[in-house]
Interface confidence: low
Amino acid sequence: GITIPRNPGCPNSEDKNFPRTVMVNLNIHNRNTNTNPKRSSDYYNRSTSPWNLHRNEDPERYPSVIWEAKCRHLGCINADGNVDYHMNSVPIQQEILVLRREPPHCPNSFRLEKILVSVGCTCVTPIVHHVA
Amino acid sequence: GITIPRNPGCPNSEDKNFPRTVMVNLNIHNRNTNTNPKRSSDYYNRSTSPWNLHRNEDPERYPSVIWEAKCRHLGCINADGNVDYHMNSVPIQQEILVLRREPPHCPNSFRLEKILVSVGCTCVTPIVHHVA
């Protein structure tokens, strides 16, 4: 049959011991070179739905440190600087990919894992359930 | 320093042709089994800093589809439903890991890449610069 020319520089990943396995170069290419390094670093304090950042560390995971946002209040901060409980602070969550060392303590063997992280908080109008 | 004993079942990936290369099992383990699938799906509309979600697709990347948040307004929505320009809607950004196929057309070879994505928006008090 017709074959697509395989790039001659492709790694040989035919090892039968590693089904469902691909080769991954860990020399990370960062596409964010032109971004402001400060980014949203002070938004957690200036937001009407402020949050604290908690360090989640796991040496068997890459990246080993992930910062988790926890909303400071149930409500949102109003113009007077007080918490308004007619509004809700809620976490904005995102599923991210991480590499989990597998089998454990193997320096060169990982498995893809999806985890849900809270990135920050936003202020939303609550869903009010009216009782008949 | 203290060394963690290497698991005897570890793959041998000491091939000198593949510096910084590891084996990754693509059979994704999802740690989010107990999360509400709806999650923050309606926050983009209910937020005082609402956002739209734009589809970013790249067939040479995993995940191939990433949703990018774009804040709808410069200001935030007040209690009357109007845009208040004394406050600012800002994107909450996060660096995430993706897999990029490299070299091209190698079916089982990838490189880790960091990209910056906007996950949602939050309402912040603006930084006001007073002119003397």
Epitope: E14, P19, V22 | P63
Partner: nanobody
Framework: QVQLQQSGGGSVQTGGSLTLTCAAS????????LGWFRQSPGKEREFVAA???????DYADSVKGRFFISRDNTMNTVYLQMNSLKPEDTGIYTC??????????????WGQGTMVTVSS
């Protein structure tokens, strides 16, 4: 050499059945999602079905309930069982392999294609 060798196909009457087979060689079979695309006369190539290495299966809406994809990792083979065939199923069916196929409906490795003709 990476190769996907197809067999099956041919002509059939409306309502008939056919099975397509695709045998892979030269790649880590289990590390790839495998699937089928088709190109009908005068149309773009379109996704038909795929099965991932996690055994997740996706079908195009137009073939759901009629076509069934399966894979045999011991034989490095993927199959497409096509039932209740319609004239609009006519086209060249091509096998595809790719680690990302299931998520992006695109592939880097293709078979040679095989013709399926459904007459009314």
């Amino acid at each position: 050499q990476v190769q996907l060798q197809q067999s099956g196909g041919g002509s059939v009457q409306t309502g008939g059945s056919l099975t397509l087979t695709c045998a892979a060689s030269g790649l880590t079979f289990e590390a790839n999602s495998l699937g089928w695309f088709r190109q009908s006369p005068g149309k773009e190539r379109e996704f038909v079905a795929a099965v991932s290495f996690t055994k997740r299966i996706d079908y195009a809406d137009s073939v759901k309930g009629r076509f069934f994809i399966s894979r045999d990792n011991t034989m490095n083979t993927v199959y497409l069982q096509m039932n209740s065939l319609k004239p609009e199923d006519t086209g060249i069916y091509t096998c595809a392999a790719d680690p990302l196929l299931i998520s992006n409906k695109r592939a880097n490795i293709w078979g040679q294609g095989t013709m399926v003709t459904v007459s009314s």
